[in-house]
Amino acid sequence: KELKVTQPEKSVSVAAGDSTVLNCTLTSLLPVGPIKWYRGVGQSRLLIYSFTGEHFPRVTNVSDATKRNNMDFSIRISNVTPEDAGTYYCVKFQKGPSEPDTEIQSGGGTEVYVLAKPSHHHHHH
């Protein structure tokens, strides 16, 4: 089956301090290679999560990525801050022959808007 990386939501809004899920599914697990999430594009893009065993604070996988037929690479970002705003891309790589893995396809991106946390005013009578 032809490989396609799908990010169904073009954008999501989340209140500061809350958590949000960024969805990403693949149509094929071949060719082999890791899936990674980035914020931004180009040389300055920031690695947010990699499905290669490392620990990323505040970011977890949503489904059990250890299933050999898993094609759901959605992530949850917890305790969102205003600095987390931006466009997130789910990227599929093909393993490289003794060299860096090659990016072969990216999802369309999901823009995260971070809303100010509503302030709670206590009124004393």
């Epitope: 071949l30 065993g53 990525a65 299933k67 003794s98």
Partner: antibody
């Protein structure tokens, strides 16, 4: 320090059953897929079963499918291998192994010997 | 029979370089690893993901890949490197973990 300790091996008659256990420590057991690999006397390594971290998905080669069942209890940090309808060719040292993110093996137990003989 | 193919034996003098090859898997669906096993002991992982070395493994062990063949290279071979070496794989197309038949490394002298 990652530790995997197998137990439950022994001598069993052809057609019999045996359950192996693997006690894991030193890592977050519930986050890792696990496998069983065996080695017949004087022979090479053979993968016999794999299981996802959550335990819902299991995998086997044709040589043991329908006879062996892999399972896990994440609350006890323990991996199991239930072996039924055992044959002489199942005689081997059985190792439990932790899987990497791409289903290779990074840590191995010391093994437990299973002998199928009448 | 083993799905992956590696030579049954390799001999090398101390200080020389040993190379063990493994072939048989599809490049697009396979990841490879190398395991060392000494007599009476459990296997030890030397290389995973074709060329990644665990932090506790000496730098003289390295892995590389070219097409459908992967190679374990042991530079400056030492007497303690005498062991059996197994190539192992993960095949994403079948969800299985094939092994090679093993290579016995003999350190001469």
């Amino acid at each position: 320090e990652v530790q995997l300790v197998e137990s439950g091996g022994g001598v069993v008659q052809p057609g019999g059953s045996l359950r192996l256990s693997c006690a894991a420590s030193g890592f977050t057991f519930s986050s890792n897929a696990m496998s069983w690999v065996r080695q017949a006397p004087g022979k090479g390594l053979e993968w016999v079963a794999g299981i996802s971290a959550g335990g819902s998905d299991t995998y086997y080669p044709a040589s043991v499918k329908g006879r062996f069942t892999i399972s896990r209890d994440n609350s006890k940090n323990t991996l199991y291998l239930q072996m039924n309808s055992l044959r002489a060719e199942d005689t081997a040292v059985y190792y439990c192994a932790r899987e990497t993110w791409n289903h290779l093996f990074d840590y191995w137990g010391q093994g437990t010997l299973v002998t199928v003989s009448s | 029979s083993y799905e992956l193919t590696q030579p049954p034996s390799v001999s090398v003098s101390p200080g020389q370089t040993a190379r063990i090859t493994c072939s048989g898997g599809s490049y697009s669906s396979y990841y490879y690893a190398w395991y060392q096993q000494k007599p009476g002991q459990a296997p030890v992982t030397l290389i995973y993901s074709d060329d990644k070395r665990p932090s506790n493994i000496p730098e003289r062990f390295s892995g590389s890949s070219s097409g459908t063949t992967v190679t374990l290279t042991i530079s400056g071979v030492q007497a303690e490197d005498e062991a059996d070496y197994y190539c192992g794989g993960y095949d994403q197309s079948s969800y299985t973990n094939p092994f090679g038949g093993g290579t016995k490394l003999t350190v001469l002298g």
